[in-house]
């Protein structure tokens, strides 16, 4: 470091250092002044600072603080933002795969159902995607709608392929009969349980990541109080007013000042810790039926089993539905 | 544990699933994220210290500035004197957080509550008997959570299938598939899906 300077009879060095922040010299006294108007850098004797300089220092100090805070959180912010994007895209890919698997299953095993089945499957997985992204959709309704839509097609194409066109207006009745007769056994309920549990967890996982981003963004853009600005000015700049151009703040003093400035922000700490630990617990539980990847990619198999179940009981069902959905009784299922 | 067979037999027709070597599943990626997040668990309490360590403070110098005067770095005055004539620091702390911070704390409390609710110890959740009316149905065995469905000729268990750097590809475009096709056999190949997602550090 340079040797300590002799006392400055003029304010020459203070003037030059102030120009780092503010071009021009009109705010800096030519020679030391009493400084009775100063509010932050309270002088013990004559000073080379003016009220205008103090104001500039305070403004700069608060901007410095904001930049320091932003640089402190940059790595954490990037970590959460990138992961939120990665997982959102990954979940969309899982949904797309699940849809393709299910469509492939229909194409391979029930080609006669495919045109309509593809449509219903597509609608179901669109709803799944929307639900994950926070849409206000009921999972049970989604599953019910899938099976309600599928059953009339299964009945008319697989169970009763020779059904005359005149009988095709019984769709509403078939939808009603599907639930009343538990046509697919407990498979719809099974799917509801698995899909709702796995999607709920997935949805809250994404919500939590997005809130994490919001937390960092909020603290990143905090405006520091005037009191904090005064403390920072005194710590970083007031030494200049005494001609001390090379000294740095004491470490302990810096900690005290920062704790004062950050008192509000530090209150987040308790809830932030809990957030990370709760998220960890959630992630540890995301397996089996709480893992959407596992559940959705296995749906094609469960749906296939549910159709086999219907086929196995086709004789019994056809008789019952023939009676229930005769024209005279059609209305009660509307 | 669950497995995903190389060949899925469905009504004697085969859906071949691409064999994937990559072990980076969604679940491993989630765990990796949590480990990284845990290194930031003290982020907010550590902020004052972090900022002091990234702003100029006297480390090797004999003298330092305490807000009022030049003092010896290890003297009592180094932390104390500078605070004397400043406004009341206790007062500053008593003001409490500003409204935006209070709001974000409320949101954190809410999400923490939701996360805790979701993470409750999980009991058995599926009915063992899939059909209450007595029609035949496959038995899911002891581990109902793992049973994705089964009937007649044996159930299929599913392993976490989507791998991060590999996509299971079928050689049919299901959206344009002709309705009367009797069989479509997926290829044993892989298509990279996550190439554009990069690694998160």
């Amino acid at each position: 470091q340079p040797p300590p300077p002799p006392p400055d009879a003029t304010c020459h060095q203070v003037r030059s250092f102030f120009q780092r922040l503010q071009p021009g010299l009109k705010w800096v006294p030519e020679t030391p002044v009493p400084g009775s108007d100063l509010q932050v850098c309270l002088p013990k004797g004559p000073t080379c600072c003016s009220r205008k300089m103090e104001e500039k220092y305070q403004l700069t100090a608060r901007l410095n603080m904001e930049q320091l805070l932003q640089s402190a959180s940059m790595e954490l912010k990037f970590l959460i933002i990138q992961n939120a994007a990665v997982f959102q895209e990954a979940f969309e890919i899982v949904v797309r795969h699940a849809k393709n698997y299910t469509n492939a299953m229909f194409k391979n095993n029930y080609p006669s159902l495919t045109p309509q089945a593809f449509e219903f499957v597509g609608e179901f997985f669109t709803d799944v995607s929307l639900y994950i992204l926070g849409s206000d959709i009921n999972v049970d309704d989604m599953v019910n709608e899938l099976f309600d839509s599928l059953f009339p097609v299964i009945y008319t194409q697989l169970m009763n392929p020779g059904l005359p066109d005149s009988a095709l207006d019984i769709n509403e009745c078939l939808r009603g009969a599907r639930r009343d007769l538990k046509v697919f056994g407990n498979f719809p309920k099974l799917i509801m349980t698995q899909v709702s549990k796995s999607l709920q967890v997935t949805r809250i996982f994404l919500q939590a990541l997005n809130l994490g981003i919001e937390v960092i963004n909020t603290t990143d853009h905090l405006k520091f109080s005037k009191d904090c600005g005064r403390m920072l000015t005194r710590m970083w700049y007031c030494s200049y007013c005494q001609g001390l151009m090379m000294v740095k703040p004491c470490g302990g003093y810096c900690n005290v000042v920062m704790q004062g400035c950050m008192a509000g922000v530090v209150e987040i700490d308790k809830y932030w810790r809990e957030y990370i630990l709760s998220l960890e617990e959630l992630v540890n539980g995301m397996y089996r039926i709480y893992d959407m990847e596992n559940v959705l990619l296995g749906l094609f198999s469960t749906i296939h089993d549910s159709i086999q179940y219907v086929q196995k009981n086709a004789g019994k069902l056809t008789t019952t539905i023939g009676k229930l959905c005769a024209h005279s009784q059609q209305r009660q299922y509307r | 544990s669950a497995y995903y067979p190389e060949d899925l037999f469905i009504d004697k027709k085969v859906l071949k699933v691409a064999h994937v070597e990559h072990e980076e599943t969604l679940s491993s990626r989630r765990r990796e994220l949590i480990q990284k997040l845990k290194s930031f668990i003290s982020f907010y309490s550590a902020l004052p210290g972090y900022i002091c360590s990234h702003s100029p403070v006297a480390e090797n110098d004999t003298l330092c500035w305490n807000g009022q005067e030049l003092v010896e770095r290890y003297s009592q005055k180094a932390a104390r004197n500078g605070m004397k004539n400043q406004f009341n620091l206790h007062e500053l702390k008593m003001k409490g957080p500003e409204p935006v911070v209070s709001q974000i704390i409320d949101k954190l409390k809410h999400i923490n509550q939701l996360l805790r609710t979701m993470s409750m110890p999980k009991g058995r959740v599926l009915d063992k008997n899939l059909d209450e009316e007595g029609f035949e149905s496959g038995d899911c065995g002891d581990d109902e959570d793992e049973c994705i469905g089964g009937s007649g000729d044996g159930m299929i268990k599913v392993k976490n299938q989507l791998r991060f750097l590999a996509e299971l590809a079928y050689d049919l475009d299901v959206d344009d598939a002709p309705g009367n096709s009797q069989q479509a056999t997926p290829k044993d190949n892989e298509i990279s899906t996550f190439h554009n997602l990069g690694n998160v550090h």
């Epitope: 700069t60 901007l63 410095n64 030494s239 | 702003s55």
Partner: nanobody
């Protein structure tokens, strides 16, 4: 270990030119703003010039504007001060200093200085 080593000082006649260099190590040079500060014999410190990390932004004290040019080569981790039309009052020890993240605040690190003497 942060190190700043100045070189290029010497004796020069009024109106002459000199180019000072400062070799930096021990930190990420390209992301640090840098300054030149001088101390004339028997006088206090005077800030001379500053340059941003990328080199895109520069700043000078009024007394050297138009005569001195600050620059940097981030690939060589080196800071420069091109001094033209030198005057007797430019005689001083020139220090290069690493700016901290506190704009206009205390410098993080200083070099040991290089002496420039302007005399006929």
């Amino acid at each position: 270990q942060v190190q700043l080593v100045e070189s290029g000082g010497g004796l020069v006649q009024p109106g002459g030119s000199l180019r000072l260099s400062c070799a930096a190590s021990g930190f990420t040079f390209s992301s640090s703003a840098m300054s030149w500060v001088r101390q004339a014999p028997g006088k206090g410190l005077e800030w001379v010039s500053a340059i941003s990390g990328s080199g895109g932004s520069t700043n000078y004290v009024d007394s050297v504007k138009g005569r001195f040019t600050v620059s940097r080569d981030n690939s060589k981790n080196t800071l420069y001060l091109q001094m033209n039309r030198l005057r007797a009052e430019d005689t001083a020890v020139y220090y290069c200093a690493k700016e901290s993240m506190v704009r206009g605040g205390p410098f993080d690190y200083w070099g040991q200085g290089t002496t420039v003497t302007v005399s006929s």
